[in-house]
Amino acid sequence: APPRLICDSRVLERYLLEAKEAENITTGCAEHCSLNENITVPDTKVNFYAWKRMEVGQQAVEVWQGLALLSEAVLRGQALLVNSSQPWEPLQLHVDKAVSGLRSLTTLLRALGAQKEAISPPDAASAAPLRTITADTFRKLFRVYSNFLRGKLKLYTGEACRTGDR
């Protein structure tokens, strides 16, 4: 991927829209939308005060860890859906899109240098352990996906792209 493709706001906006659509189709869906188990996902709440004061490397750690855990969670959701007796087609479609979207975002972040940022000392050592919550429905899983993109990921890319502009 081109190194700064993710710095084009329309790129992230596309994935955000997909995540929002996925969240919307699961609104009011009970029968097909239970995960039947608790899946660990990143806590997407952002402490804006603390975030702004973090070094970009520390932000990268949080984003990279969160993205990894979220990808794992969505893959688990996909596996549960595949193994269910009658997977609901619209849900299947959006889960597949989310898996593909998270893969692409991982590639785009790697191209931006987020992985390098995340493992460079001293930031990696001082990063707080990733806060997590659990999701027991696809709605909550998609909500976490959407909030993660709107929150930490967007804040990080904004700062990383701005820093890279100088």
Partner: antibody, heavy 116, light 108 residues
Framework: QVQLVQSGAEVKKPGASVKVSCKAS????????MSWVRQAPGQGLEWMGW????????NYAQKFQGRVTMTRDTSISTAYMELSRLRSEDTAVYYC?????????WGQGTLVTVSS | SYELTQPLSVSVALGQTARITCSGD??????VYWYQQKPGQAPVLVIY???KRPSGIPERFSGSNSGNTATLTISRAQAGDEADYYC???????????FGGGTKLTVL
């Protein structure tokens, strides 16, 4: 002790500009973002924008974009907020507020009156 | 842009429990901050990160947040609690802070 001391009250005519200062003491000025919040008489708090004193980068509330400019002078640990094209609705107390884990330290406020 | 809605006023009998609400779209997914402001004074924070109290704030003050509503609870209300209370969070779409309209608490 840690404190923020703001400049005195101002009376301005509509269409003019006002520049309010906020002098920080008792802490490292460049280590904390600074926000500006205003409060019209009998009204609620309204966030205007923030400045990062270390880098000088800013972010303004949509409502004030194009009219507000936040700057700083690190040599004298002072933040400034300038509001242009004043109108009567801009009559308010303007506060600077340090961002710690929240808005932890506030200035005493500067009353800006816009009147013809 | 993101909006936070508070009731204009809340009344509570002395010694009873007051609850002040702050509504916003999916506010349960955000941290919420509560400020107390007395006439002629700058605001003072009473709750941060949704449910934490800074030192010096009595245990009577507590916060919670779920769904579309955050709540500031003041138990055993005292005359000195009379003030305006503001909730605050942020708009992630614009990276900006947002205050609620404020609630005037009256202790009867």
């Amino acid at each position: 002790q840690v404190q923020l001391v703001q400049s005195g009250a101002e009376v301005k005519k509509p269409g003019a500009s006002v520049k309010v200062s906020c002098k920080a003491s008792g802490y490292t000025f460049t280590s904390y973002y600074m926000s500006w919040v205003r409060q019209a008489p009998g009204q609620g708090l309204e966030w205007m924008g923030w400045i990062n004193p270390l880098k000088g980068n800013t972010n303004y509330a949509q409502k004030f974009q194009g009219r507000v400019t936040m700057t700083r002078d690190t040599s004298i640990s002072t933040a400034y907020m300038e509001l242009s094209r004043l109108r009567s609705e801009d009559t308010a107390v303007y506060y600077c507020a340090r961002e710690g884990m929240y808005f932890d330290i506030w200035g005493q406020g500067t009353l800006v009156t816009v009147s013809s | 842009s993101y909006e936070l809605t508070q009731p204009l006023s809340v009344s509570v009998a002395l010694g009873q429990t007051a609850r002040i609400t702050c509504s916003g779209d999916s506010i349960g997914d955000k941290y919420v901050y509560w400020y107390q402001q007395k006439p002629g004074q700058a605001p003072v924070l009473v709750i941060y990160d949704t449910n934490k109290r800074p030192s010096g704030i009595p245990e009577r003050f507590s916060g919670s947040n779920s769904g579309n509503t955050a709540t500031l609870t003041i138990s055993r209300a005292q005359a000195g609690d009379e003030a305006d209370y503001y909730c605050q969070s942020w708009d992630l779409d614009f990276n900006t802070y947002v205050f609620g309209g404020g609630t005037k608490l009256t202790v009867l």
